[in-house]
Interface confidence: medium
């Protein structure tokens, strides 16, 4: 294997998985173990990410791509490329500085991550509460109180078009 010399940067011939080795008159050397180069023409290889502790390996490092991590059970990823692992809580809880705490009355969290959010205020939409909220579930809004008055049709008529030319949803 003889690398052809050209007027362009000789390192541009080095493919992903190699680096342009200054110690060897700029021939393309393979990346050392536990390192990678994802693009051609690199003068160094990059150190593979190591998924340690609360991180676990989702994808092994190869000579051309970095390792990818996710989180061990009981934790979830945060940040670009799973840069952090955050403790899971139960549904109906949120993570605080003091650990997992139950959602306050009037709030809920239906996931193992994130914060408790206020129940929907049905009355703002002119609706009534059909099913009460819990720490784990939002309220379910039903028809407005007027719709449920005696003699009112149980079939909800179509809502008017909000703009001309738009058919009802």
């Amino acid at each position: 294997f003889e690398r052809t010399r050209s007027l362009q940067d000789p390192c541009s011939n080095c493919p992903a998985g190699t680096f342009c080795d200054n110690n060897r008159n700029q021939i393309c050397s393979p990346c050392p173990p536990n390192s990678f180069s994802s693009a051609g023409g690199q003068r160094t290889c990059d150190i593979c990410r190591q998924c340690k502790g609360v991180f676990r390996t989702r994808k092994e490092c190869s000579s051309t791509s970095n390792a990818e991590c996710d989180c061990t059970p009981g934790f979830h990823c945060l940040g670009a490329g799973c840069s952090m692992c955050e403790q899971d809580c139960k549904q109906g809880q949120e993570l605080t500085k003091k650990g997992c705490k139950d959602c306050c009355f009037g709030t809920f969290n239906d996931q193992k991550r994130g914060i408790c959010r206020p129940w929907t205020n049905c009355s703002l939409d002119g609706k009534s509460v059909l099913v009460n909220g819990t720490k784990e579930r939002d309220v379910v809004c039903g028809p407005s109180p007027a719709d449920l008055s005696p003699g009112a049709s149980s079939v909800t008529p179509p809502a008017p078009a909000r703009e001309p030319g738009h058919s009802p949803q």
Epitope: F19, N23, C31, S35, T44
Partner: antibody, heavy 127, light 113 residues
């Protein structure tokens, strides 16, 4: 544990071709440079050349015209051929592995200190 | 080629005393990109292949006793055996791996006085 085992003819006549082979047992064959180094009796060490799994080679300019180093990845072997030998080529020939790269500051560089050596083969050239 | 010159050629030291071997390269082997000196030290006993002691000028290979230490930068390097033991009798070589062809010093023979 990585071990290097080498073999080849030990007695040659002038103008013949020296031929040695080194087999790598254990560890990774790719990702390293594999070298041949020689040592004339009572003298110092001289690097002959190196090869990687892809077949890329580097040779010592002082020997380049007579040397061929090749690789057989299916057998984890690399070989040395030295043409037109003379008495000056009488030496113990060693195969050796280049140490792993050094990673610092987010980047990696090769470092070819030789961390693993074969047992050596004494090659005598005599008419 | 980078020429490696060792001094002295031979050295006789009493057991338990310090042995110091010098190595000088004809050009710097310090690589500015990673601030590493591309220099190694080897020990060779009769009938055996060389054994790597030190790489990156000062990093001890695993399993090497801590009485062996390497120092220096650029063109001037030193291998020190802080307290010579009987089993340290050998020839010691320095080697540069900064640029091909990789080259070795001529060797320093260490004996017991």
């Amino acid at each position: 544990q990585v071990q290097l085992q080498q073999w080849g003819a030990g007695l040659l006549k002038p103008s013949e071709t020296l031929s040695l082979t080194c087999t790598v047992y254990g560890g990774s064959f790719s990702g390293h440079y594999w070298s041949w180094i020689r040592q004339p009796p009572g003298k110092g060490l001289e690097w002959i050349g190196e090869v990687i799994h892809s077949g890329t080679t580097n040779y010592n300019p002082s020997l380049k015209s007579r040397v061929t180093i090749s690789v057989d990845t299916s057998k984890n072997q690399f070989s040395l051929k030295l043409n037109s030998v003379t008495a000056a080529d009488t030496a113990v020939y060693y195969c050796a592995r280049g140490l792993l790269g050094e990673c610092s500051g987010g980047s990696c560089y090769y470092g070819d200190a030789f961390d693993i050596w074969g047992q050596g083969t004494m090659v005598t050239v005599s008419s | 080629d980078i020429r490696m010159t060792q001094s002295p050629d031979s050295l006789a030291v009493s057991l338990g005393e310090r042995a110091t071997i010098n190595c000088k390269s004809s050009q710097s082997v310090l690589y500015s990109s990673n601030n590493k000196n591309y220099l190694a030290w080897y020990q060779q006993k009769p009938g055996q292949p060389p054994k790597l002691l030190i790489y990156w000028a000062s990093t001890r290979e695993s399993g090497v006793p801590d009485r062996f230490s390497g120092s220096g930068s650029g063109t001037d390097f030193t291998l020190t055996i802080s307290s010579l033991q009987a089993e340290d009798v050998a020839v010691y070589y320095c080697q540069q791996y900064y640029s091909t062809p990789w080259t070795f010093g001529q060797g320093t023979k260490v004996e017991i006085k």
